[in-house]
Amino acid sequence: MHSDCIFKKEQAMCLEKIQRANELMGFNDSSPGCPGMWDNITCWKPAHVGEMVLVSCPELFRIFNPDQVWETETIGESDFGDSNSLDLSDMGVVSRNCTEDGWSEPFPHYFDACGFDEYESETGDQDYYYLS
């Protein structure tokens, strides 16, 4: 499947997951906390204030770094998986905190968490794609 299609599919799946999670958690527009979101890179489930959400590195970085192997689980397609199985000390794990002011930025930032060889990538630009 073309990489553009993969990410359109991932985005669509993300919106479905968020909707299901909102129903499970009793979230609505006026609920305190952080709404689930697709940040154009990966999917983030809804969270309560004070909650840290962990995700494994998104598909984008498997395309950037095809040789990179992560020890962490890939989050399931049908739901958000078990965040408890992920650990921030693992390579390939990114977190966001839900604060009173909304979502924090990813920690670490995606490149630091997921690895990126900018020199190797110089040659592979014809395979590169844009997220829409």
């Epitope: 940040d39 924090s104 930025e105 990813p106 920690f107 930032h109 995606y110 630009d125 590169y128």
Partner: antibody, heavy 120, light 107 residues
């Protein structure tokens, strides 16, 4: 090596517009977020805006929101800052910087800056 | 927005002395705090990322520590080229912010 060269600065009257450019080379521009940071004469650094690698995410400092627009042309390896309704307090050296990330990141390489002077 | 406060505003020291610079955030930024050095007429240079992670090409005399709201940049033994302004920067919450800077000058 990473090179960032800003241009487009100059003297402009309050209320007028200016567009800054930043030409990037030495790295795969289309894979990195990019920032604008400014520094008023004799003052500290002020973060202005950031754009994600594909232009899909843009964020601004409150002081410029609604007046400044960050954009990029990945085919030209160029970052832009469109500045409208300029004020005297916008007078500063404007730096473009690479964000070490696809989304936002922290600035890791900086240009030498272009000076914008807003004065009547 | 998160406000970063740096102290002292100016630090007057002699070459060979130890410099300790502080950065305090108005709310937790976790470890998403980075340090930059700026010399007159030059662009800033990234020194330390994520509070304590060193970068290649940066002398080992520069080190960082802290998490949450309190951070420290330490220069173990000042070299003549270290006299400059140092800024902390948080990339934890948008809008991103910089501290006002600490100027390290020669005593």
């Amino acid at each position: 090596q990473v090179q960032l060269v800003e241009s487009g600065g100059g003297v402009v009257q309050p209320g007028r517009s200016l567009r800054l450019s930043c030409a990037a080379s030495g790295f795969t521009f289309s894979r990195f977020a990019m920032h604008w940071v400014r520094q008023a004469p004799g003052k500290g650094l002020e973060w202005v805006a950031v754009i994600s690698y594909d232009g899909g995410n843009k964020y601004y400092a409150e002081s410029v929101k609604g007046r400044f627009t960050i954009s990029r042309d990945n085919s030209k390896n160029t970052l832009y800052l469109q500045m409208n309704s300029l004020r005297a307090e916008d007078t500063a050296l404007f730096y473009c910087a690479r964000g070490y990330d696809v989304l936002t990141g922290y600035p890791d390489y900086w240009g030498q800056g272009t000076l914008v002077t807003v004065s009547s | 927005e998160i406000v970063l406060t740096q102290s002292p505003a100016t630090l007057s020291l002699s070459p060979g002395e130890r410099a300790t610079l502080s950065c305090r955030a108005s709310q937790s930024v976790g470890r998403s705090l980075h340090w930059y050095q700026q010399k007159p007429g030059q662009a800033p240079r990234l020194l330390i990322k994520y509070a304590s992670q060193s970068l290649s090409g940066i002398p080992a005399r520069f080190s960082g520590s802290g998490s949450g709201t309190d951070f420290t940049l330490t220069i173990s033994s000042l070299e003549p080229e270290d006299f400059a302004v140092y800024y902390c920067h948080q990339s934890s919450m948008l809008p991103f912010t910089f501290g006002p800077g600490t100027k390290v000058d020669i005593k």
